[in-house]
């Protein structure tokens, strides 16, 4: 007894096509691209039916159902728009990912299409959703403002400025990503094994402000070349935060220097440093203070400190800043803060130095502030961030 002629399901085809199907004859069903075999709502990899001796097929005909990529993944600090139609997630549907404007950006164009493999796919073939990366280095601060010799900062001037509080100590740091803080190794060395006891505050101008964004450290990474109590070479550390902070006008990372940034940090070029450290009056600043200071000649700085503190070395991993006449400097309590420069090409601020050490007499003539030269540590920073 022959089996009934099989009729291909919509969006499917049958092979082989025969005039008659008798005992042990078989046919397979294939779906058009963008459709998948379903039987009893269960996805099938393949389908073959066999004609039985009673003249019936051993399996009912499956259906060819349009591929559904499902709802796209949520995009932290962004959103997704359905382009093809409201909530349409089937084959060839298009969605558009966008980041929250001003404070986040994405590297791709954010357009994804539902492809035949059931994945939302970008034009570059990426299956993972895009990432909204924090914008860095935007500030309301302009160079030319007349710490020691400093002025109070205004909201949005230094949104990367971070206050690090221990039980009895205070230092600073700079946000360089939404979950990474750059600081001086000496400022956090004692906390390296007890990171959780470090209190991290951001989004503030007043040191004692009750309105701050709290962050907690997950781990502290001290540069392996730093030796505590034996000079300040490699005085650099990274703090990984337990959670990402939300970027806004008062909390934003500072950029890391581009390779070309070295040309913006030559002698006499002006940078800006902010902090809550000691002021001219010898008291910790209540309000975040900043000072615009020029980079000092490295040889001059080295000579000054060789005379002042024999045995203390100003290495190639350091840069000096300050006026020969004195009066403008960072001081105790500013440690770990960022010495920042404006990149004229991108119009973004980048961190060129980290407040490290200097003369006991902050702001004294011919006694410069010494900063960790960040550009020397870009590979180290990138390695830590990518691996942890």
């Amino acid at each position: 007894r022959p089996c009934p002629d099989p009729t291909a399901p919509p969006n499917g085809s049958i092979s082989p096509v025969q005039a008659i199907y008798v005992l042990k004859d078989r046919f397979s069903v294939f779906c058009k691209t963008g459709f998948e075999l379903l039987q009893g709502s269960v996805p099938l990899k393949s389908f073959t039916a066999v004609c039985q001796k009673d003249g019936s097929w051993d399996r009912p005909m499956p259906e060819c159902s349009i591929i559904d990529c499902g709802p796209p993944d949520d995009l932290p600090n962004g959103h997704v728009d359905y382009i093809t139609g409201p909530e349409v997630t089937t084959y060839k549907a298009v969605i558009q990912y966008s980041c929250e404007e001003t404070f986040y950006t994405m590297s791709s164009n954010g357009k994804y299409v539902c492809e035949a493999d059931g994945f939302w796919t970008s034009s570059k073939g990426e299956k993972l959703p895009p990432v909204c990366e924090p914008v860095c280095g935007l500030s309301t601060h302009t160079i030319g403002g007349r710490i020691v010799g400093g002025q109070p900062a205004k909201p949005g001037d230094f949104p990367w400025q971070v206050l690090l509080l221990g039980q009895t100590t205070a230092a600073a740091g700079a946000l360089i990503h939404d979950n990474w803080v750059l600081t001086a190794a000496h400022a956090v060395y004692e906390k390296r094994m007890a990171a959780s006891s470090l209190n991290i505050r951001m989004g503030i101008l007043k040191r004692l402000s009750p309105h701050y964004t709290q962050a907690w450290p997950e781990e502290i990474f001290i540069h392996e070349g730093y030796t505590h109590g034996a000079g300040f070479d490699n005085d650099i550390a990274l703090i990984k935060l337990k959670n990402k902070v939300t970027i806004n006008g008062s909390i934003m990372p500072v950029c890391l220097p581009r390779k070309e940034a070295a040309s913006l940090m030559r002698t006499d070029f002006t940078g800006t440093v902010a902090g809550w450290g000691l002021t001219q009056k010898g008291l910790l600043a209540r309000n975040l203070m900043f000072v615009d200071i020029p980079i000092a000649d490295h040889q001059k700085c080295t000579a000054v400190y060789e005379k002042l503190y024999p045995g203390v070395r100003v290495s190639a991993n350091m840069l000096c800043a300050g006026l020969e006449t004195g009066g403008k400097d960072s001081c105790r309590g500013d440690a770990g803060g960022a010495l920042v420069f404006l990149d004229n090409e991108t119009q973004r601020w980048f961190v060129g130095g980290i407040v490290s050490w200097g003369s006991i007499n902050c702001g004294a003539a011919d006694q410069y502030g010494v900063y960790t030269k960040v550009i020397n540590y870009i590979p180290w920073i990138e390695n830590i961030i990518s691996n942890f």
């Epitope: 009893g40 996805p43 990899k45």
Partner: antibody
């Protein structure tokens, strides 16, 4: 983000009917056209699929349990339920409710409840 | 209804590759799914339709299915991968699970 929560008595007497409810939060049970399932795990043993229900009410059951199982859906309460009759000690298990990965497909289960322990004992 | 057979246990050193097999009659003709279950927790889908990874599952988890055997491979195994792993398929509209494999990460 869709979350599932099982609820029901933790102790059932032999020969009685076990009744569990799964409450869906963070999304409507009827909006995504998903399948919703029940899976159980006896103590120290593996997983066993009990059955699945489509948002519209169509059901599929494990043949080994089919005569004792009823799964229903109540879209107004955003819940679906399991009833297992004539229980014995062999029905003692952690019972999980879960949601299918893709709409309109009985595919993998990608969202699970935390599970509820049911003990059958007199 | 098919039976899925898994080895009861697999041991692996950190950083090494763990392979868990799941055998069943003509399993390669059907889709295989894999779940990870840690003690006291609900199962988590790690592989669906033989080879696909849900979002959030690390790339070190991969799947393959051919002939009568599906395989879950964990490359560069980490201590956090220690768990029970279950394979699953759909056979004639019925969901079928393997008995599970306990993966132990040594050290």
């Amino acid at each position: 983000q869709v979350q599932l929560q099982e609820s029901g008595p933790g102790l059932v007497k032999p020969s009685e009917t076990l009744s569990l409810t799964c409450t869906v939060s963070g999304g409507s049970i009827s909006s995504g056209e998903y399948f919703w399932g029940w899976i159980r795990q006896p103590p120290g043993k593996g997983l066993e699929w009990i059955g699945s229900i489509y948002y519209s009410g169509s059901t599929y059951y494990n043949p080994s349990l089919k005569s004792r199982v009823t799964i229903s859906v109540d879209t107004s309460k955003n819940q679906f339920s399991l009833k297992l009759s004539s229980v014995t000690a062999a029905d003692t298990a952690v019972y999980y409710c879960a949601r299918s990965l893709k709409a309109a497909r009985r595919d993998a289960f990608d969202i699970w409840g935390q599970g509820t322990t049911v003990t059958v004992s007199s | 209804q098919s039976v899925l057979t898994q080895p009861p246990s697999v041991s692996v050193s950190p950083g090494q590759t763990a392979s868990i097999t799941c055998s069943g009659h003509k399993l390669g003709d059907k889709y295989a799914y894999w779940y990870q279950q840690k003690p006291g927790q609900s199962p988590v889908l790690v592989i669906y339709q033989d080879t696909k990874r849900p979002s959030g599952i690390p790339e070190r988890f991969s799947g393959f299915n051919s002939g009568n055997t599906a395989t879950l491979t964990i490359s560069g195994t980490q201590a956090t991968d220690e768990a029970d792993y279950y394979c699953q398929t759909w056979d004639s509209s019925t969901g079928v699970f393997g008995a599970g494999t306990k993966v132990t990460v040594l050290g």
